[in-house]
Amino acid sequence: AMHVAQPAVVLANSRGTASFVCEYASPGKATEVRVTVLRQADSQVTEVCAATYMMGNELTFLDDSICTGTSSGNQVNLTIQGLRAMDTGLYICKVELMYPPPYYMGIGNGTQIYVIDPEPCPDSDF
């Protein structure tokens, strides 16, 4: 299987946005790549978003996706937006080399994303 590396821990910012790099060790010269982000929580695995891209081009996510990303060589820079405290969990990066053959798949160990909901601003008397 293809090796995929990603950071162990990332903290979302106050706006609920988290970014991390997913890097894969390509055994060949892939021209078309599919990247999927999956969330694992309480032994349940759900798909967060998925994109395909041609090497050197932007990642193409679905219109309603909460993810955006860019690619550079064998690195994919992923950003997940709109996160809340309940979305805290292990986010796993999966990379598939779709073309040319042979097909390869690699699955990272996951990035634990911590999301802290911001405290509401106290009412001011001013």
Epitope: A1, L38, V45, T46, E47, A50, I92, M105, I107
Partner: nanobody, 119 residues
Framework: EVQLVESGGGVVQPGGSLRLSCAAS????????MGWFRQAPGKEREFVAD????????YYADSVKGRFTISRDNSKNTVYLQMNSLRPEDTALYYC????????????WGQGTLVTVSS
Amino acid sequence: EVQLVESGGGVVQPGGSLRLSCAASGGTFSFYGMGWFRQAPGKEREFVADIRTSAGRTYYADSVKGRFTISRDNSKNTVYLQMNSLRPEDTALYYCAAEPSGISGWDYWGQGTLVTVSS
């Protein structure tokens, strides 16, 4: 133990059509993904198409886009590959594969069904 059994292969003329079927037994059919791959003699195994169960989203290799259609019938525990406008270069052994969860990889494979496109 999950078993995948393909059927529907055969000899067809260029421009013809075939429908491959892959029946799953021995386990749940609520897989994360089901896919078709192919391998021509002397060549590497190639991704053809897959369908992800969560949203029924499909994905195709460029070489078959617009000609092949993947679908599934959960009530029959079966995934299909409708192949139209077949070309000689589509000749290969076609394998069905199942991915139990998004992080499992393609854990289950069928034995394959041979498709030959020749005049």
